[in-house]
Interface confidence: low
């Protein structure tokens, strides 16, 4: 799997999980989240050569097409596969609220 | 939806469905498929600015991050959303076989 266990321990130019820490205030302009101040969102990036973690038959076809037609702009893209939620604390007035924001953390990637 | 009905009728630089015809022999080197000779595979391409058909909370966060940090390499990517199968005819020896290849045709796109 193109997850932290593989990607963060290997130098990999192909599609892989990349570390990205996001500070809510500085990076998103979100001042309403009290805790945490930021989080390890991570992101997916890298090339999608033929058969590199292809998600669907179409992405396999597209990467093969791209191999045979390298000048073509049609190629698969490295995107998130498994995502996890993030629990946040915020306030409505003086009332603390705890909420789980779904699909906030990327755990693994795929070529799609 | 970023499908043919919208994308093929609008000049759109942002993420959208793009037409792509694939000839099995010429473009993929596949000689085993007897019919069809090729098909409209289509593909997804284009920019993913903030809130443009974001697939997940993470892709929304990432596009907002990218707006505030335009020099960053972390940004969402335009990929397939809905896919359809393609029915093919091929031969094993002299015996014709009909098979449905799943996820061969892209019908719509998303920013992920």
């Amino acid at each position: 799997a193109l997850d932290a266990a593989y990607c963060f321990r290997n130098v990999q130019d192909n599609c892989c999980l990349r570390p990205l820490y996001i500070d809510f205030k500085r990076d998103l302009g979100w001042k309403w989240i009290h805790e945490p101040k930021g989080y390890n969102a991570n992101f997916c990036a890298g090339a999608c050569p033929y058969l590199w973690s292809s998600d669907t038959q179409h992405s396999r076809v597209l990467s093969l097409y791209n191999t045979i037609n390298p000048e073509a702009s049609a190629s698969p893209c490295c995107v998130s596969q498994d995502l996890e939620p993030l629990t946040i604390l915020y306030y409505i007035g003086k009332t603390p609220k705890i909420e789980q924001l779904s699909n906030m953390i990327v755990k693994s990637c795929k070529c799609s | 939806a970023l499908d043919a009905a919208y994308c093929f009728r609008n000049v759109q630089d942002n993420c959208c469905l793009r037409p792509l015809y694939i000839d099995f022999k010429r473009d993929l080197g596949w000689k085993w498929i007897h019919e069809p000779k090729g098909y409209n595979a289509n593909f997804c391409a284009g920019a993913c600015p903030y809130l443009w058909s974001s697939d997940t909370q993470h892709s929304r966060v990432l596009s907002l991050y990218n707006t505030i940090n335009p020099e960053a390499s972390a940004s969402p990517c335009c990929v397939s959303q809905d896919l359809e199968p393609l029915t093919i005819l091929y031969y094993i020896g002299k015996t014709p076989k009909i098979e449905q290849l799943s996820n061969m045709i892209v019908k719509s796109c998303k920013c992920s």
Partner: antibody, heavy 118, light 108 residues
Framework: QVQLVQSGAEVKKPGESLKISCKGS????????VAWVRQMPGKGLEWMGW????????RYSPSFQGQVTISADKSISTAYLQWSSLKASDTAMYYC???????????WGQGTLVTVSS | SYELTQPLSVSVALGQTARITCSGD??????AHWYQQKPGQAPVLVIY???DRPSGIPERFSGSNSGNTATLTISRAQAGDEADYYC??????????FGGGTKLTVLG
């Protein structure tokens, strides 16, 4: 093999400026954070801050915020730690380290000894 | 700010098992890492992600982390294990923090 090579020892006077460097090789420089760690004579390790060279994000320990500046030039795979006005209390060994996303430092530089004395 | 507390020193007889603790608020909910530093040398990562060992680190080194305490265990201690050991973790803002360090002495 992965290496972090730091610039040589420095002897400076209080009030002077200084920029020390840490050059990464043997890996994709923009794919890992670089952290700076201070160790004063006979004392423990103190995290100063980190930079993500790929995104140019930085984060500083509150103890070092405004005291130092961390930067990087990804074109030459080098991270920097700089002071605009040194103090005698800045005398220490400074280490750079390659940092993985969840906070561990898997490779370290050899250290740069900075001595500030009038 | 987040703090990690370690004993100043730990002694162990040659060939016996040494345990070095590191305590911090809800430390078990975070990643905990351990570094070994010998005099005049840069630190070396010996345990990361609570209990994983980098290549080249002997199996005698192991880690655990639960509740408010992370523990570095060195079994069959050798003279060459004498060093300062630092635990490290981070708070919710990815502010890194080191423990104060523990001097390990191997007796005999």
């Amino acid at each position: 093999q992965v290496q972090l090579v730091q610039s040589g020892a420095e002897v400076k006077k209080p009030g002077e400026s200084l920029k020390i460097s840490c050059k990464g090789s043997g890996y994709s420089f923009t794919r890992y954070y670089v952290a700076w760690v201070r160790q004063m004579p006979g004392k423990g390790l103190e995290w100063m801050g980190w930079i993500d060279p790929g995104q140019s994000n930085t984060r500083y320990s509150p103890s070092f915020q405004g005291q130092v500046t961390i930067s990087a030039d990804k074109s030459i795979s080098t991270a920097y730690l700089q002071w605009s006005s040194l103090k005698a209390s800045d005398t220490a060994m400074y280490y750079c380290a390659r940092m993985l996303a969840w906070g561990w430092f898997d490779y370290w530089g050899q250290g740069t000894l900075v001595t500030v004395s009038s | 700010s987040y703090e990690l507390t370690q004993p100043l020193s730990v002694s162990v007889a040659l060939g016996q098992t040494a345990r070095i603790t590191c305590s911090g608020d809800n430390l078990g909910g975070y990643y905990a890492h351990w570094y070994q530093q010998k005099p005049g040398q840069a630190p070396v990562l010996v345990i990361y992600d609570k209990s994983d060992r980098p290549s080249g680190i002997p199996e005698r080194f192991s880690g655990s982390n639960s509740g408010n305490t992370a523990t570095l265990t060195i079994s069959r201690a050798q003279a060459g294990d004498e060093a300062d050991y630092y635990c490290a973790s981070y708070d919710s803002s990815l502010m890194m923090v080191f423990g104060g360090g523990t001097k390990l002495t191997v007796l005999g």
